[in-house]
């Protein structure tokens, strides 16, 4: 990695005059669970925790639920969606279900979102077992501009799991574009 | 990357004095399939190779099944579980399995466990295909303090595929704390 | 991280002299649509983009569908690779698919390949929906050596999804080897 | 409901300026990005620029670079539009609109009610 | 820029007829396409969005299709209230740009 290049306008020797420079930017981002919308169709995720629990941000913003990059560089971006079902909340709203999350990147430079990464699973829950739980993962290494901003879309939003180690999406800096 | 300063104690200025600053922490620590608990209940896994294939620990150590952080940072954390089922091995516990995994911090300062991560799935096991394969994969950014622990809790031990390709758990360190 | 010491033969005083290195090894592939294999035998996919869309490579080679490593070091890998199926595609090869992938090393001084990661799951696609969708993530933390390849090996690449955001592999140098 | 109104018709001569407002109501302002897009008498529909209202990002149509400065004010959930060296050729009917980025739409809705906008020496 | 060229720009129907408008793209812009109604005097409406979805509200006679540089809005039985300038938009990339429009009167 380029390590603290990525945050400086000078040189290596600057940095070394200078001391530690700034953090390089990171978020790791939990779901608001008293903000999960309803419904079964598709829908972005508005509302993200950025300081309790596991959640964290550093030279990152969040903002109507969209993680916006302040500082141009390559990101390890990631996603971890979790749906689950008790036959005690009622029936799913079809047996077969597609369980579905995109990471999506939108910017004031592009009209339309483009879908980053996606990942999921169609799924029978219908009777038989009274508990069902299912989790996707995905992640991948992108350049992202300042000004950009990340968000997370999902099927079925009425079957996440609200627990801050089950649905959450993050970032980290990993070098500087040249 | 705050790159070097997360792993001295001086200035930038010491380190291109001294030259190379120490590698950053790490593990990525593989099954051991001798060890591997039976049953269908919730287990820790307290056994896991880190010196041979493709396991291996730098400024980390690891302890009863337990991976312990020897110096603050950010790390990114990740765990790939795999199930397999043979006819041939007899029947599953259960035909509605929850194949789940859980990535754990302990702390000698928090008396109890705390969940980072997990994922999985409820499948049906049942009859009609002689061979069932399950993978799971989570992976997220957190913060960790020297002394803090990470442990791999899994539901059905005895259905882990044990290769070294299928069932490991690592970890890296990103940055610094400021 | 190590940062730049990963990329310079010389001391951390010769960085600060010289200003920023050279950007660390990183790569992002992304499935050519035009060449999935049929079938569904276990292949390795042997095409994929570097240029185009989020694809991208530096420091690295993308050489018939291999990923070449030109720098020692540990690397953090990745793998996202989706299977879908519509009714209107014709049936699927068999109602008890095996969806699996395989993340592999070569080395020309190694004749065999070794699986670094696996992830998958069986899966039952006979009839009762039109549509059917599955996705893998794996990642990991491992050393690699110049010369070394990176490759996927998918069973049923008939089904893979096309999309750039289903399907796709990379990897990023976190830090140098001591 | 989900609403944008605009300020009304204007009246300008070559060379100078004119500044639209479209006041939103009815949702988050800062949550969707604002859209200007102007129609000429008898034509068709030209696209000016964009401001995301949470943070001030704007991008504009090339033709107009130099000439249109969009702006908003978070305050009063008001996004405005200013067109400087008005020349005949910008008598149009000005339309701010909303871009739905929340569910995945992407298109325009709704519109203004559109103010008119006449060059005349 | 990306140009959207609209036909026919103008169109004579009877009520109940099936009505049919093109639009094609100078390039490739996925489904990132929308269809807009617009009355004499007012702001234009969104009836269709990503090619082939259409918008809460609007009735099921309207229909959008298409993919990559080639797309179509059908309205299967023209109503009284349908009469009306109908333009097609991409969202692919900026500047956004729309077709000349389809102007549809009555027969």
């Known amino acids: 990695f380029s390590g603290a290049p990525a945050m400086m306008e000078g040189s290596w020797l600057d940095v070394a005059q200078r001391g530690k420079p700034e953090a390089q930017p990171f978020a790791h981002l939990t779901i608001n669970a008293a903000s999960i919308p309803s419904g079964s169709h598709k829908v972005t995720l508005s509302s993200w925790y950025h300081d309790r629990g596991w959640a964290k941000i550093s030279n990152m913003t969040l903002s109507n639920g969209k993680l916006r990059v302040n500082q141009d560089g390559f990101y390890y971006l990631y996603a971890n969606i979790c749906f689950r079902h008790h036959e005690t909340s009622g029936s799913v709203p079809t047996d077969y279900l597609q369980l579905m999350v995109y990471v999506v990147k939108t910017s004031i430079k592009i009209p339309s979102s483009h879908n980053l990464m996606k990942g999921g699973s169609t799924k029978n829950w219908s009777g038989n077992s009274e508990f069902h739980f299912y989790s996707i993962n995905v992640g991948g290494f992108f350049k992202l501009r300042a000004g950009e901003e990340i968000s997370i879309q999902v099927s079925n939003p009425s079957l996440l799991d609200p627990d801050q180690d089950a649905t959450y999406f993050g970032a980290f800096k990993v070098q500087d574009i040249d | 990357f705050s790159g070097a300063p997360a792993m001295m104690e001086g200035s930038w200025l010491d380190v291109a004095q001294r030259g190379k600053p120490e590698a950053q922490p790490f593990a990525h620590l593989t099954i051991n399939a001798a060890s591997i608990p039976s049953g269908s209940h919730k287990v820790t896994l307290s056994s896991w190779y880190h010196d041979r294939g493709w396991a291996k620990i730098s400024n980390m150590t690891l302890s009863n099944g337990k991976l312990r952080v020897n110096q603050d940072g950010f790390y990114y954390l990740y765990a790939n579980i795999c199930f397999r089922h043979h006819e041939t091995s007899g029947s599953v516990p259960t035909d509605y399995l929850q194949l789940m995994v859980y990535v754990v911090k302990t702390s000698i300062k928090i008396p109890s466990s705390h969940n980072l991560m997990k994922g999985g799935s409820t499948k049906n096991w049942s009859g009609n295909s002689e061979f069932h394969f399950y993978s799971i994969n989570v992976g997220g950014f957190f913060k960790l303090r020297a002394g803090e622990e990470i442990s791999i809790q899994v539901s059905n031990p005895s259905l882990l595929d044990p290769d070294q390709d299928a069932t490991y758990f690592g970890a890296f360190k990103v940055q610094d704390i400021d | 991280f190590s940062g730049a010491p990963a990329m310079m033969e010389g001391s951390w005083l010769d960085v600060a002299q010289r200003g920023k290195p050279e950007a660390q090894p990183f790569a992002h592939l992304t499935i050519n649509a035009a060449s999935i294999p049929s079938g569904s035998h276990k292949v390795t996919l042997s095409s994929w983009y570097h240029d185009r869309g989020w694809a991208k490579i530096s420091n690295m080679t993308l050489s018939n569908g291999k990923l070449r490593v030109n720098q020692d070091g540990f690397y953090y890998l990745y793998a996202n690779i989706c299977f879908r199926h519509h009714e209107t595609s014709g049936s699927v090869p068999t109602d008890y698919l095996q969806l699996m992938v395989y993340v592999v090393k070569t080395s020309i001084k190694i004749p065999s390949s070794h699986n670094l990661m696996k992830g998958g799951s069986t899966k039952n696609w006979s009839g009762n929906s039109e549509f059917h969708f599955y996705s893998i993530n794996v990642g990991g933390f491992f050393k690699l050596r110049a010369g070394e390849e990176i490759s996927i090996q998918v069973s049923n690449p008939s089904l893979l999804d096309p999309d750039q955001d289903a399907t796709y592999f990379g990897a990023f140098k976190v830090q140098d080897i001591d | 409901q989900v609403q944008l109104v605009q300020s009304g018709a204007e009246v300008k001569k070559p060379g100078s300026s004119v500044k639209v407002s479209c006041k939103a109501s009815?949702?988050?302002?800062?949550?969707?990005?604002i859209e200007w897009v102007r129609q000429a008498p008898g034509q068709g529909l030209e696209w000016m620029g964009v401001?995301?209202?949470?943070?001030?990002?704007?991008n504009y149509n090339e033709k107009f670079k130099g000439r249109v400065t969009i702006t908003a004010d978070k305050s009063t959930s008001t996004a405005y539009m200013e067109l400087s060296s008005l020349r005949s050729e910008d008598t149009a009917v000005y339309y701010c609109?909303?871009?739905?980025?929340?569910?995945?739409?992407?298109?325009?809705?709704?519109w203004g009610q559109g103010t008119t906008v006449t060059v005349s020496s | 820029d990306i140009q959207m060229t609209q036909s026919p720009s103008s169109l004579s129907a009877s009520v109940g007829d099936r009505v049919t408008i093109t639009c094609k793209a100078s390039?490739?812009?996925?489904?990132?396409v929308a269809w807009y109604q617009q009355k004499p005097g007012k702001a234009p409406k969104l009836l269709i969005y990503?090619?082939?979805y259409r918008y809460s509200g609007v009735p099921s006679r309207f229909s959008g299709s298409g993919s990559g540089t080639d797309f179509t809005l059908t309205i299967s039985s023209l109503q009284p209230e349908d009469f009306a300038t109908y333009y097609c938009?991409?969202?692919?990339?900026?500047?956004?740009?729309f077709g000349g429009g389809t102007k549809v009167e009555i027969k």
């Open positions: 390039q490739n812009v996925g489904t990132n």
């Open positions: 938009q991409q969202y692919w990339d900026y500047p956004l740009t």
């Open positions: 401001i995301n209202p949470g943070w001030g990002d704007t």
């Open positions: 990503s090619a082939s």
């Open positions: 609109a909303r871009r739905d980025t929340a569910h995945g739409y992407y298109a325009l809705d709704p």
């Open positions: 009815g949702y988050a302002f800062t949550n969707y990005y």
